[in-house]
Every structure is written in structure tokens, then in C-alpha cells.
Interface confidence: low
């Protein structure tokens, strides 16, 4: 089943998938527990940058950029994407403990979610389902096979034998060759016609490009090295049986002298650079919780120390049809609440020695924006807002209302579609914002919908600090301070002057400053001052004052 394509070229493999590379995984290791949907840890990765399919340059940590003594010169490029960096670009040896710094880029592309099952092995070293890496170009099988320099390509298991015929032109053999690929993936070469048989090659030359697979035993914590050769070779000191070297300790070099009756001295001295133990690596989710709805970050962690040169370790990830040669990857612009599958493997000196598969479900995304149907003022102290909820999952609403610089917010039940606002201030503009939120790994707020209304008018409050003072025998000066709450559109001060029950003056000013002249001498007056806002009068402030007996 082919991977599901996506608009931007990044896909997620449907199950079952195929091996990450052609290197066969260890099959005589202990069983693993099945994978469950990967639970994220609250861990942060600080050094991730954006991974784009167009980014052709992979940054390499130069610190292995260092002791060159163990460097493997084989360049490896991706079969699917020719511009992806080679292994040689992303790995170099080191005399120290330098490791590869992640400075790749993040896949900034749409990744199709994984359908169906979670039954994927979650433990490095083996998996029940495979991934979609192309044939591993570490040891590519080409159509022209050279016997003298043959390096067997281990291919995925097949149910029937595959025969490849290659005409071989070689310094040592000139023959038409039939190469049979057995289900185990080893190449069996049978010579059909030998044109010439010159002198034998040296074993040193014949096995110059010999490749090795390392198989790890979790019980003994030892490795077995499987020599990828087509005949049963002999090893000095009888160190191998059936082309396998057993009981190799992690991170220790072992020297094996290889010979065969088809070649002459000098023998090939093979240095086995044994990888670190499989259980010393853990695939860790490094996604920042704030971004867990649309991003996935995966990172291999060294959970135990080992003495292997970390510069010789390379990491490979496949998420969909995108392949990354980094210790850490970051995928961006993903769909919230979707499952994505990533396969990963670790290589030591370009030999795969462990792998893991993760299914990660992205977090709940931010809810959408609610749709406000209407919001208006019903009365001087009340308003109402009604809305339709957003489509996406959410837990509750937050309604905020702002008057001038004051802001009040309240949480509303997710089932509400209407809210009556009480105790509002009359004749005041209220700006309302309504957003849904969801409590996921962090609280995610949706976009806010906005609306506004102005409450109806109401009677203003009383003027205050009213004073009445005599300016002459028959004149008074009345002053007051504005009301605390005007509660309406206009501003007018009124003064009513009564003598007994008779209204003798009624004045209206823009300011509360009245000069009342020509009053009767020696008379008791009642002064009533109030504010009118254009719709309603306020409560009057009342003072009593008497004119004096004329002094003249």
C-alpha cells in the first residue's frame, strides 16, 4: 500500500509499512511490548529550526568534524529525494565525546494523519510493523555486480527468489553472472560461464568493502556481527561460525582476520566497531506543550553513558514520505487532534542497530471563533449577547466586557448561547469579547468575537458640594459640583428658587454657577439645584438661605 500523498509532498504511511532501510533488523532479540499512542512529556527543545523540503543543506556538528581515524567514506544519498543530505554530510568521527548537533530544519508541510491501528512496537531494536524508508543506500544493489568488490545488499524479505543477471567485467573475473536473491536477502552468485580465470585476488582486496550487520541480544547485552559475504569465510583463531562473530561487547573494537580459498594472502583484517547497546537510546517527545496542537518534535536521547564515539552515530527519521538525517526533528503545521506516525532508526558507522516507531496524537487545537448573533442594551443597567458556538472542541467560554478602561471577564458554561449582563452603568459604551477555550496540555484560547453596545440613559446622580453665599443684601451666589454619574447624553444644570411654596426663579446653565439677584430682603428662600442629562433630571440638592434686612 503506497503512502498517502499530501498537497505539500509530506505523507504519513498507512499500515502496514515497509522497512526503514534494507538493513534487516535484529530478529533474535527479545520480544517488545506493543506501542500505545505516545504520551508527550513536558519537555522543551530549544534548538529546532524550520524543516523544509527545499532546504538542501544539512548543518553538521563540526566537533566530530574531528579525529578522522574511524571515518567511513561511503556517501549515502536518499533514493526518494536526491537533494537530501548524504550520510557523509551528517556524520564524522571524533576522538572525543563530541556528538552530532541537531541543526536541521523542521518539516514545514502538511502531513497526512495515520489511519487506524496503534499496534506498533514502541521499543528500539525491533518492530512488528515496518516503515516506509526506501532501500537503504548504504549498501545499494546496482545492476552491475562486481565479484571482486562485492558488498551484499541486504534486502527486505521476499516470498520468492529474485534473480538478477549482470555482466561482470572485473580485474579478476570475466563472466556472465546469475545472482539469486534468496528470501533472507543474501545474494547467492552462481557462475554460469567463465570466460577467463586469472590469478586469485588477495583476500584483502576481495573483502575490501565487506559490510556487517549487528544483532543485539537484550538478555546477554552482547552483539553478534553478521558478515555479509556470499561464501562461508574462515576467520583467524576460529572467531566466527557461519559468517557470524558472536559475543561482541558494545563500543569495543574487535579485529577479525578473514580468508577464503577463493582468494590469496594477505587476509582481510576487519575491524568491527561494535555499536552501543540498544537500550541506551530512547526516543523522546520534545514537543513544547504550547505548540503540541500543530507540531511534533522527536528526539533520540542517550539515557545511559557509553564509550562509543558519538560522532559515528547517525539518526534517521521518516514521517510520511519525508526523511530526515537528524537526532531531532520538528514537524510543523500539522492538524490538531490527529495521529501521526514516525519511524526512526539509529546507525553506527552507517550500520543500523536499533529503531523505533511512534504514533503521536497532536493536542486539541484552539477552538474556532464563536459567531455573535446580536448584542444590545435592553435597559440602562442591562445588556444581552447571543451567539452560536464554534465548530471545534472546547470546554467553556470567556466573556469580557470593557467600559472605558475597566475590564471584567467571566467564565461561561459551554452550553450557553445567551448571556444577560446586569448591573451595567447607564449611557456607557460596552465592548464585549467572547472566546471559547479548551484546557488541553495548556489552555488554548480561540479567536475572540467582538461586539459593542451603549446602555440606555437613566437619571443622573445628585449634584454635590452645593453652596449658597450672599453677595449683597438681595443677591445670592449658588455653586455646585457635577454629579458623579451623568447617565445621559447632555449636560445642563438647573436652579429653582422658591419663597414659601412659590417658584420665584428657574434658571438653567451649562455650568453649576448661578448668580441670583433682586431677591426680597429678609426672606427665607429654598434653593434646589439638579442636573439634567437630556433624558432625565437628577435628584435636587436643596439648601435654605435667607436674605438679610437691608443695610441701607
Amino acid at each position: 500500500q503506497s503512502p498517502t500523498p499530501s498537497p505539500t509532498g509530506l505523507t504519513t504511511a498507512k499500515m502496514p509499512s515497509v522497512p526503514l532501510s534494507s538493513d534487516p533488523l535484529p530478529t533474535h532479540t527479545t520480544a517488545f511490548s506493543p506501542a500505545s499512542t505516545f504520551e508527550r512529556e513536558n519537555d522543551f527543545s530549544e534548538t529546532t529550526t524550520s524543516l523544509s523540503p527545499d532546504n538542501t543543506s544539512t548543518q553538521v556538528s563540526p566537533d566530530s568534524l574531528d579525529n578522522a581515524s574511524a571515518f567511513n567514506t561511503t556517501g549515502v544519498s536518499s533514493v526518494q529525494t536526491p537533494h537530501l543530505p548524504t550520510h557523509a554530510d551528517s556524520q564524522t568521527p571524533s576522538a572525543g565525546t563530541d556528538t552530532q548537533t541537531f541543526s536541521g530544519s523542521a518539516a514545514n508541510a502538511k502531513l497526512n494523519p495515520t489511519p487506524g491501528s496503534n499496534a506498533i512496537s514502541d521499543v528500539p531494536g525491533e518492530r512488528s510493523t515496518a516503515s516506509t524508508f526506501p532501500t537503504d543506500p548504504v549498501s545499494p544493489l546496482t545492476t552491475t555486480l562486481s565479484l571482486a568488490h562485492h558488498s551484499s545488499a541486504a534486502l527486505p524479505a521476499r516470498t520468492s527468489n529474485t534473480t538478477i543477471t549482470a555482466n561482470t567485467s572485473d580485474a579478476y573475473l570475466n563472466a556472465s553472472e546469475t545472482t539469486t536473491l534468496s528470501p533472507s536477502g543474501s545474494a547467492v552468485i552462481s557462475t554460469t560461464t567463465i570466460a577467463t580465470t586469472p590469478s586469485k585476488p588477495t583476500c584483502d582486496e576481495k573483502y575490501a568493502n565487506i559490510t556487517v550487520d549487528y544483532l543485539y541480544n537484550k538478555e546477554t547485552k552482547l552483539f553478534t556481527a553478521k558478515l555479509n559475504v556470499n561464501e562461508n569465510v574462515e576467520c583467524g583463531n576460529n572467531t566466527c561460525t557461519n559468517n557470524e562473530v558472536h559475543n561482541l561487547t558494545e563500543c569495543k573494537n574487535a579485529s577479525v582476520s578473514i580468508s577464503h580459498n577463493s582468494c590469496t594472502a594477505p587476509d582481510k583484517t576487519l575491524i568491527l566497531d561494535v555499536p552501543p547497546g540498544v537500550e541506551k537510546f530512547q526516543l523522546h517527545d520534545c514537543t513544547q506543550v504550547e505548540k503540541a496542537d500543530t507540531t511534533i518534535c522527536l528526539k533520540w536521547k542517550n539515557i545511559e553513558t557509553f564509550t562509543c564515539d558519538t560522532q559515528n552515530i547517525t539518526y534517521r527519521f521518516q514521517c510520511g514520505n519525508m526523511i530526515f538525517d537528524n537526532k531531532e526533528i520538528k514537524l510543523e503545521n500539522l492538524e490538531p487532534e490527529h495521529e501521526y506516525k514516525c519511524d526512526s532508526e539509529i546507525l553506527y558507522n552507517n550500520h543500523k542497530f536499533t529503531n523505533a516507531s511512534k504514533i503521536i496524537k497532536t493536542d486539541f487545537g484552539s477552538p474556532g471563533e464563536p459567531q455573535i448573533i446580536f448584542c444590545r442594551s435592553e435597559a440602562a443597567h442591562q445588556g444581552v449577547i447571543t451567539w452560536n458556538p464554534p465548530q471545534r472542541s472546547f470546554h467553556n467560554f470567556t466573556l469580557c466586557y470593557i467600559k472605558e478602561t475597566e475590564k471584567d471577564c467571566l467564565n461561561l458554561d459551554k452550553n450557553l448561547i445567551k448571556y444577560d449582563l446586569q448591573n451595567l452603568k447607564p449611557y456607557t459604551k460596552y465592548v464585549l469579547s467572547l472566546h471559547a477555550y479548551i484546557i488541553a496540555k495548556v489552555q488554548r484560547n480561540g479567536s475572540a468575537a467582538m461586539c459593542h453596545f451603549t446602555t440606555k440613559s437613566a437619571p443622573p446622580s445628585q449634584v454635590w458640594n452645593m453652596t449658597v453665599s450672599m453677595t449683597s443684601d438681595n443677591s445670592m451666589h449658588v455653586k455646585c459640583r457635577p454629579p458623579r454619574d451623568r447617565n445621559g447624553p447632555h449636560e445642563r444644570y438647573h436652579l429653582e428658587v422658591e419663597a414659601g411654596n412659590t417658584l420665584v426663579r428657574n434658571e438653567s446653565h451649562k455650568n453649576c454657577d448661578f448668580r441670583v439677584k433682586d431677591l426680597q430682603y429678609s426672606t427665607d428662600y429654598t434653593f434646589k439645584a439638579y442636573f439634567h442629562n437630556g433624558d432625565y433630571p437628577g435628584e435636587p440638592f436643596i439648601l435654605h438661605h435667607s436674605t438679610s434686612y437691608n443695610s441701607k
Epitope: 530549544e46 534548538t47 548543518q59 553538521v60 556538528s61 563540526p62 566537533d63 566530530s64 568534524l65 574531528d66 579525529n67 578522522a68 581515524s69 571515518f71 567511513n72 567514506t73 557523509a88 564524522t92 568521527p93 571524533s94 576522538a95 572525543g96 565525546t97 563530541d98 556528538t99 552530532q100 548537533t101 541537531f102 541543526s103 564515539d309 558519538t310 560522532q311 537526532k327
Partner: antibody, heavy 118, light 112 residues
Framework: QVNLLQSGAALVKPGASVKLSCKAS????????IHWVKQSHGKTLEWIGY????????NYNEKFRRKATLTVDKSTNTAYMDISRLTSEDSATYYC???????????WGQGASVTVSS | DVVMTQTPVSLSVSLGGQVSISCRSS???????????LNWYLQKPGQSPQLLIY???NRLSGVPDRFSGSGSGTDFTLKISRVEHDDLGVYYC?????????FGSGTKLEIK
């Protein structure tokens, strides 16, 4: 005493190429990377790239990827840097330096001055 | 690229005095092995640069203990105590954790 001996000063015309050499002695040449560094007159140091003498593997500063080519001759323990399409901007002193995994650039050549002038 | 900014551009010190040179990076460059490959070099007049301190605070064999390096994250310092005449020249910091390797613009140390 580790020694990196560089070729002498060079006066070259614009558009031409120059090949600088760096001969290593008193250590195992293939055990250390060779890095190349540019120092324009009175200016700071700029890293050009490195080569693994054992494998021939190279890595370059993007700025110099089309300008410099690094090679080695293991038989003579010599590293080379070819600078092509020379302009006045390439006038500088170029240093070779060796590097291990733990200790970076612990030995430097004496520098090779390149002057580009018509 | 990791940009390295050195301050001051130059400084003058009396013999026997003490100086500090600051180096600030545009981003953290801790290598994934946990090491910070921040190095200090001295280029004496008319000579090639020479390594003084590697991995922030490790003195190269033969470098006097008057030279000390410190710092973490994006801020690093080279301290020279009991300055001698032989210490004059241009001091460079450089990071070797990320490609491309980058250097500071240099601090010229002069003797009063």
C-alpha cells in the same frame, strides 16, 4: 613538535586561481582534520572549511563553497586549498590549522598571504 | 550563523594589571553532547593565532594559569591577571559547535 608549513606569499591576477599548500609533520596526518581560515587585512578570522585527510570528506562554509576546494595528498602529508575566480575580496592571509575531537585548532600554519592585483 | 560579538574592541592595561574580555553569541551553541565549544585564541603581532582556552574554561597545555575562561549560554569571558608584556596582541573568541565555525571580531590588548 607539530608543524604545519604553508606555501609562500602569492601575487595573482583577478580571475585566476591559486593553490595553497599546508605540509604536516611530526604527527599522524590522517588522524586530524585540517581546517582553513581566512584573515583579511586587519580583520577577523573567517572559517572556510575542513577536510578529513583519511577519507577526503570535506565540509565548507556556504560562503566559500564555490570559492575554495580542499584536497589532500596523503603520500606527502600535505593539504591543499584551491581558490578560484580571484577578486580583490580574496586578498588575505590564509591559515591551515589542525583539529581533534576534543581540542580545536591547537596548531596553526604560519599563514600564506594572497594578493590579488592586476 | 552564530554571530560572536566581542567587547571591548581594544583596551590598554598596565603590566601586572588585570583585564576581562567579553564575548557574546547571537544564540546558544551547546553541542548535543552537552559541551559548549567556545575557544579563545591570541594572535600576537605578525604571528598566527594560537589556541589559549578551549571548551569555555580548559587551558591548553603550556598556557599560564593567569588566563582563565568562564561563562555559559551566550555570555563568555576571558580574564587575564598579572598581565605581562608577552600577552599583547589580538584576542579572538570562536565557537566550534555549529557549522559554520565563527569567530569574534577581536579585542586588541595594548600595554600602557
Amino acid at each position: 613538535q607539530v608543524n604545519l608549513l604553508q606555501s609562500g606569499a602569492a601575487l595573482v591576477k583577478p580571475g585566476a586561481s591559486v593553490k595553497l599548500s599546508c605540509k604536516a609533520s611530526s604527527y599522524t596526518f590522517t588522524d586530524y582534520y585540517i581546517h582553513w581560515v581566512k584573515q583579511s587585512h586587519g580583520k577577523t578570522l573567517e572559517w572556510i572549511g575542513y577536510i578529513n585527510p583519511k577519507s577526503g570528506f570535506t565540509n565548507y562554509n556556504e560562503k566559500f563553497r564555490r570559492k575554495a576546494t580542499l584536497t589532500v595528498d596523503k603520500s606527502t602529508n600535505t593539504a591543499y586549498m584551491d581558490i578560484s575566480r580571484l577578486t580583490s575580496e580574496d586578498s588575505a592571509t590564509y591559515y591551515c590549522t589542525r583539529r581533534t575531537g576534543v581540542i580545536p585548532m591547537d596548531a596553526w600554519g604560519q599563514g600564506a598571504s594572497v594578493t590579488v592585483s592586476s | 550563523d552564530v554571530v560572536m560579538t566581542q567587547t571591548p574592541v581594544s583596551l590598554s592595561v598596565s603590566l601586572g594589571g588585570q583585564v576581562s574580555i567579553s564575548c557574546r553569541s547571537s544564540q546558544s551553541f551547546v553541542s548535543s553532547d552537552g559541551n559548549t565549544y567556545l575557544n579563545w585564541y591570541l594572535q600576537k603581532p605578525g604571528q598566527s593565532p594560537q589556541l589559549l582556552i578551549y571548551k569555555v574554561s580548559n587551558r591548553l597545555s603550556g598556557v599560564p594559569d593567569r588566563f582563565s575562561g568562564s561563562g555559559s549560554g551566550t555570555d563568555f569571558t576571558l580574564k587575564i591577571s598579572r598581565v605581562e608584556h608577552d600577552d599583547l596582541g589580538v584576542y579572538y573568541c570562536g565557537q566550534a559547535s555549529k557549522i559554520p565555525l565563527t569567530f569574534g571580531s577581536g579585542t586588541k590588548l595594548e600595554i600602557k
